[in-house]
């Protein structure tokens, strides 16, 4: 059975063997085409969601559609529904948290009053002056909170207890890719990760771990990427793996934040990099235990440069290593969080693409993920 | 330096099939997409469609889904365009044109596609 | 599919003018906006990508500028040269689509 499973695909009706290479071919095999159903399926960037939340401590930003124009959520009359409306609209099914905070000196947005309509936040036609003199702050979920804080040295081995929500992706048993836990269904993960296979059966994700083959895997059910830009085939590195079950939170699983849509990153940030990727360019094998290292935010301007991408560095992505080089993510370690520490952890960037491992001139190239919240959160809507 | 290189001028039939190459040079071929654009006579352009030289993958415009293919020999460093069901409409000058950060930095000479009875 | 409007569609200028070309996109497209110039007879040849990234080559008398749905070709001071038809073309997304065309002529 083991063998049948490994080289060939049951159809039904009538029952009959096909060859899995024949999976996700885009040839119709079986009789009813399930030979083509579990696929990487690509899901379009879709409309804009119309609600949001900042960086100023998590404050809720509302579109009125027939302008265009942003606001900020006033505190008056809001309610846990409203809440559980915004949060809804933005694809997340857990219970929010919500509190006041005061308007401060540099808020640029007005400041309206919010009401529901037909499942959707909208403004109150007579809002008037914002009275409670605060603001929204949501949280949708629980996030980016670790049991320990790691030491900012140059490469370590990292313990789970400081990233529980990273995990292994595997086909067929092997390490592919590294991902992110973002709610309990969802991980986060690369699109280029799934080129080589397209058939949803055989990936499989492993979570709560430092060692690669210690822990139990979990089936996905949906393996969802961006549309192909063939202007630009490095952008939309970025694929939302659906598991077939909800994960269990605990010390070692858990999620990390995405970004707020206003996250921008100045040069020389530090930021985190975690994976089991190659610890030498050509260097032969993965690491059994998972890696940590501190890098930095490098200039796009200096990343596109003639001496390093030559423009090829786009605005949905970002650079991050040490001036020096030395110190990068590598082969294995594609689809992994590239964090962000404030309040909480958040997956500012997507492992991606990049000439080489620790080049000085050519750092590790991320997919910027505050660039695909919009798509996030349409594909998250989609499957509620 | 870099050179894309088409095939000459074609007259055709209405309903017969046209492939034009594009030889690449001066560059590494598996480097860069290749995209088609063709422009009717006194019109604007339109793009039909890419390929990959690495893999071979290739995407098309939804106008010429089922009428196109583009093809690839590695060894040659050449990509083909066939359009086949040709009609009048179709009489154009088609363009392979290379990809490098979102714009089509080197364009070959043309070449030119009447269709006609 | 993303529609591209150029305007004007024809222009008449003279050698040492300002000229300006504007494109506007149906929905916003960011910064992923290429011009390109075509002389008769001749392939287009690219002049600005990403709305302002001056192509190697080009003369610094073009610039780019806009974001979201509206864009602006300049010609600082036109050269004999510089006389043919503009295109602009979006890169957001497949099918990649042109602008009509906007053809600058001599007065």
């Known amino acids: 059975k083991v063998i049948l499973d490994k080289y060939y695909f049951l159809c039904g009706q009538p029952l009959h063997f096909i060859p899995r290479k024949q999976l996700c071919d885009g040839e119709l095999d079986c009789p009813l085409g399930e030979d083509e159903e579990h696929c990487v399926k690509s899901f379009p960037e879709g409309p804009a969601v119309a609600v949001r939340l900042s960086k100023d401590r998590s404050t809720l930003q509302v579109l009125d559609s027939a302008t265009g124009n942003w606001f900020s959520a006033c505190f008056d009359n809001f309610t846990e529904a409203l809440a559980e409306t915004a949060c809804r609209q933005m694809g997340y099914s857990s219970k929010p948290t919500f509190r006041a905070v005061e308007i401060g000196p540099d808020q640029d947005l007005d400041v309206v009053e919010i009401t529901e309509n037909s499942q959707e936040l909208r403004m109150r036609n007579s809002s008037g002056p914002c009275l409670s003199g605060s603001l929204v702050s949501l949280h949708c979920l629980a996030c980016g909170k670790s049991l320990k804080t790691p030491r900012v040295v140059g490469v370590e081995e990292a313990s789970v207890d400081s990233w529980p929500w990273q995990v292994s992706i595997q086909y067929d048993k092997q390490h592919v890719c590294g991902g992110s836990i973002l709610d309990p269904h969802w991980v986060l993960t690369a699109a280029h990760c799934f080129r080589k296979h397209t058939d949803v059966f055989n990936w499989k994700v492993r979570a709560g771990s430092d060692k690669l083959g210690s822990f139990p895997s979990l089936a996905v059910a949906k393996i969802i990427i961006i549309e192909f830009n063939p202007m630009y085939p490095k952008d939309n590195d970025i694929a939302l793996m659906k598991l077939q079950f909800p994960l269990t939170f605990s010390g070692t699983v858990r999620p990390i934040c995405l970004p707020f849509f206003d996250e921008e990153l100045t040069p020389a940030t530090p930021l985190w990099i975690i994976g089991w990727g190659f610890t030498k360019q050509n260097g032969g094998k993965m690491s059994d235990i998972l890696l940590q290292a501190s890098v930095q935010v490098i200039d796009s301007t200096r990343c596109n440069a003639d001496d390093a991408y030559q423009g090829e560095v786009t605005e949905k992505m970002m650079c991050a290593g040490i001036p020096e080089g030395g110190v990068d993510t590598c082969q294995g370690d594609s689809g992994g969080p590239l964090m962000y520490q404030s309040d909480q952890w958040h997956v500012v960037g997507i492992v991606s693409w990049g000439y080489g491992c620790g080049g000085p001139s050519t750092p590790g190239v991320y997919t910027k993920v505050s660039a695909y919240l919009n798509w996030i959160y349409n594909v998250w809507k989609a499957e509620l | 330096q870099v050179q894309l290189v088409q095939s000459g001028a074609e007259v055709k039939k209405p309903g017969a099939s046209v492939k034009v190459s594009c030889k690449a040079s001066?560059?590494?071929?598996?480097?860069?997409?290749l995209h088609w654009v063709r422009q009717a006579p006194g019109q604007g352009l339109e793009w039909m469609g890419w390929m990959n030289p690495d893999s071979g993958n290739t995407g098309y415009a939804q106008n010429f889904q089922g009428r196109v293919t583009m093809t690839r020999d590695t060894s040659t460093s050449t990509v083909y365009m066939e359009l086949s069901s040709l009609r009048s409409e179709d009489t154009a000058v088609y363009y392979c044109a290379r990809l490098h950060r979102g714009g089509h930095d080197y364009w070959g000479q043309g070449t030119l596609v009447t269709v006609s009875s | 599919d993303i529609q591209m409007t150029q305007s004007p569609s024809s222009l008449s200028a003279s050698v040492g003018d300002r000229v300006t070309i504007t494109c506007r996109a149906s929905?916003?497209?960011?910064?992923?906006l290429n011009w390109y110039q075509q002389k008769p007879g001749k392939a287009p040849k690219l002049l600005i990508y990403a709305a302002s990234t001056l192509q190697s080559g080009v003369p610094s008398r073009f610039s780019g500028s806009g974001s979201g749905t509206d864009f602006t070709l300049t010609i600082s001071s036109l050269q004999p040269e510089d006389f043919a038809t503009y295109y602009c073309q979006q890169s957001y997304s497949t099918p990649v689509t042109f602008g009509q065309g906007t053809r600058l002529e001599i007065k």
């Open positions: 929905q916003s497209i960011s910064r992923y």
């Open positions: 001066g560059y590494s071929f598996s480097g860069y997409y």
